[in-house]
């Protein structure tokens, strides 16, 4: 570092340095002046600063502070923005895959139900996507609409394939009968439970990430108060007025100033910590029926089971519906025959099994681990900013806001500061309105995250299905037994080999099982052909 220059009788040094900030010299005195008009860099003697220079320094200080704040949050901001986008896209891909699986199941097993089934399935999954993105749609209504729409087609195409055209105006009656007679058993209710729980959690997860971005953006673009601007100017630039170009502010002094300037922002800390911990709790609970990937990719199987359930009870249903829908005279066509092996074997019921490699679930946990490294982000900001701005090491030979000192004393500096503005007053003013608003939003999301209906207090037994039945055991009503179909479990392998295949799109024609007319139980459904 250069040796301290001799006293500057001409302000040449100050003039030269000020030109870095402001071309031209009209604002800089040629020789030291009393500086009685100065409001921030109050001189102890003659000074080389003018009021205009002081204003320029204040503007520079505030701009630099904003820039420092933005660079402090850059990594965190990028982490959340990137993950919010990645998860949103991944959820859309899961929905697309789930739709394609379901369409493939219809195409392979019930070709007579297409294209109507494709249309209803498409509408259902469109609603799923909209719900995840925040639309005001009721999940139960979505599921009811799917089954209400499917049943008339199943009834007229599968159960009574020979029904004459004159009998085809009974759709509304069939839609009503579907609910009244519980023609699909408990499957619609099961799907409602699984889909609503998993989508609710997915939706709140995305909402929470987007709020995280909003929090960072808010604090990133804070406009600092005039008092803060004065404190920063005093710390960073007032030494220039005395020709002390190489002197750095004392570290302890910087901490005092930053705590004053950042008092409002630091108030976010408590709610930010809670936000990350609540998000972690949510993510930890996102498995089984709380994991949309698991639920949606297994939906085709449950829908298939629900149709088999209808087929099994076709005889009984046809008679009842014939009376209910007042077309009994046309009920002479025999129901289509379905071989016994398509019926549900209640003793081998199993829930769709999932093999996880790098799935969304591992990606979520990875995000939480990274976020947890930013848990003290707001409380650490004052320290971060001081460590990334010019400060003197060890608080020796440094600027304390008034003069060059051998050693920094907080008490002396505080006394000096009181002459200009009360640091305590600055802290007492409370946070900016925008900070108060973002705190309210954080409180709200934290409340939502905490009150999410998640499995708490006990780990779900892996041998139990969603309704609490053991595999192979059903409820009292044998006809309403629910679960995965067939003599084994359906495997959905590597649900999404997450990042490597993010943009992968599965068309119906490429969907698993299209090479043969078989039920999904005969195929191992593989999302990607490894």
């Amino acid at each position: 570092q250069p040796p301290p220059p001799p006293p500057d009788a001409t302000c040449h040094q100050v003039r030269s340095f000020f030109q870095r900030l402001q071309p031209g010299l009209k604002w800089v005195p040629e020789t030291p002046v009393p500086g009685s008009d100065l409001q921030v860099c109050l001189p102890k003697g003659p000074t080389c600063c003018s009021r205009k220079m002081e204003e320029k320094y204040q503007l520079t200080a505030r701009l630099n502070m904003e820039q420092l704040l933005q660079s402090a949050s850059m990594e965190l901001k990028f982490l959340i923005i990137q993950n919010a986008a990645v998860f949103q896209e991944a959820f859309e891909i899961v929905v697309r895959h789930a739709k394609n699986y379901t369409n493939a199941m219809f195409k392979n097993n019930y070709p007579s139900l297409t294209p109507q089934a494709f249309e209803f399935v498409g509408e259902f999954f469109t609603d799923v996507s909209l719900y995840i993105l925040g639309s005001d749609i009721n999940v139960d209504d979505m599921v009811n609409e799917l089954f209400d729409s499917l049943f008339p087609v199943i009834y007229t195409q599968l159960m009574n394939p020979g029904l004459p055209d004159s009998a085809l105006d009974i759709n509304e009656c069939l839609r009503g009968a579907r609910r009244d007679l519980k023609v699909f058993g408990n499957f619609p209710k099961l799907i409602m439970t699984q889909v609503s729980k998993s989508l609710q959690v997915t939706r709140i997860f995305l909402q929470a990430l987007n709020l995280g971005i909003e929090v960072i953006n808010t604090t990133d673009h804070l406009k600092f108060s005039k008092d803060c601007g004065r404190m920063l100017t005093r710390m960073w630039y007032c030494s220039y007025c005395q020709g002390l170009m190489m002197v750095k502010p004392c570290g302890g002094y910087c901490n005092v100033v930053m705590q004053g300037c950042m008092a409002g922002v630091v108030e976010i800390d408590k709610y930010w910590r809670e936000y990350i911990l609540s998000l972690e709790e949510l993510v930890n609970g996102m498995y089984r029926i709380y994991d949309m990937e698991n639920v949606l990719l297994g939906l085709f199987s449950t829908i298939h089971d629900s149709i088999q359930y209808v087929q099994k009870n076709a005889g009984k249903l046809t008679t009842t519906i014939g009376k209910l829908c007042a077309h009994s005279q046309q009920r002479q066509y025999r129901s289509a025959y379905y071989p016994e092996d398509l019926f549900i074997d209640k003793k081998v019921l199993k829930v769709a099994h999932v093999e996880h490699e790098e799935t969304l679930s591992s990606r979520r946990r990875e995000l939480i681990q990274k976020l947890k490294s930013f848990i003290s982000f707001y409380s650490a900001l004052p320290g971060y900013i001081c460590s990334h701005s010019p400060v003197a090491e060890n608080d020796t030979l440094c600027w304390n806001g008034q003069e060059l000192v051998e050693r920094y004393s907080q008490k002396a500096a505080r006394n000096g500061m009181k002459n200009q503005f009360n640091l305590h007053e600055l802290k007492m003013k409370g946070p900016e309105p925008v900070v108060s608003q973002i705190i309210d939003k954080l409180k709200h999301i934290n409340q939502l995250l905490r009150t999410m209906s998640m499995p708490k207090g006990r780990v779900l037994d892996k041998n139990l299905d969603e309704e609490g039945f053991e595999s192979g055991d059903c409820g009292d009503d044998e006809d309403e037994c629910i679960g995965g179909s067939g003599d084994g479990m359906i495997k959905v392998k590597n649900q999404l080999r997450f990042l490597a295949e993010l943009a992968y799109d599965l068309d119906v024609d490429d969907a698993p099982g299209n090479s043969q007319q078989a039920t999904p139980k005969d195929n191992e459904i593989s999302t990607f052909h490894n």
Partner: nanobody, 116 residues
Framework: QVQLVQSGGGLVQPGGSLRLSCAAS????????MSWVRQAPGKGLEWIGS???????YYNPSLKSRVTISRDNSKNTLYLQMNTLRAEDTATYYC??????????WGQGTLVTVSS
């Protein structure tokens, strides 16, 4: 610890030119604005000019016509080229890192003497 190590300088004939180098280490050189400053014997510091991380430059108007500042981010090195030297250019030349519009780290200084 941030380091700025200067080289070049020495005795130069009036009308001649000088090229000084400043090798930076232990910080992200390409993220910082860098400056050259000089101090004539018995005088105060004088800002010569600065270069942004992007490579754009701005100079002290009184020296602008004779000075070129450049940088090579791949080598973490800053350069000062000064032409048509006069006796009054005799000074110790310093490179400095700019942080928050202040010079927070300085090179060790290089004495340039312009004399015949």
């Amino acid at each position: 610890q941030v380091q700025l190590v200067q080289s070049g300088g020495g005795l130069v004939q009036p009308g001649g030119s000088l090229r000084l180098s400043c090798a930076a280490s232990y910080f992200d050189f390409d993220s910082y604005e860098m400056s050259w400053v000089r101090q004539a014997p018995g005088k105060g510091l004088e800002w010569i000019g600065s270069i942004y991380h992007s490579g754009s430059t701005y100079y002290n108007p009184s020296l602008k016509s004779r000075v070129t500042i450049s940088r090579d981010n791949s080598k973490n090195t800053l350069y000062l080229q000064m032409n048509t030297l006069r006796a009054e250019d005799t000074a110790t030349y310093y490179c400095a890192r700019v942080n928050m519009d202040r010079f927070d780290y300085w090179g060790q200084g290089t004495l340039v003497t312009v004399s015949s």
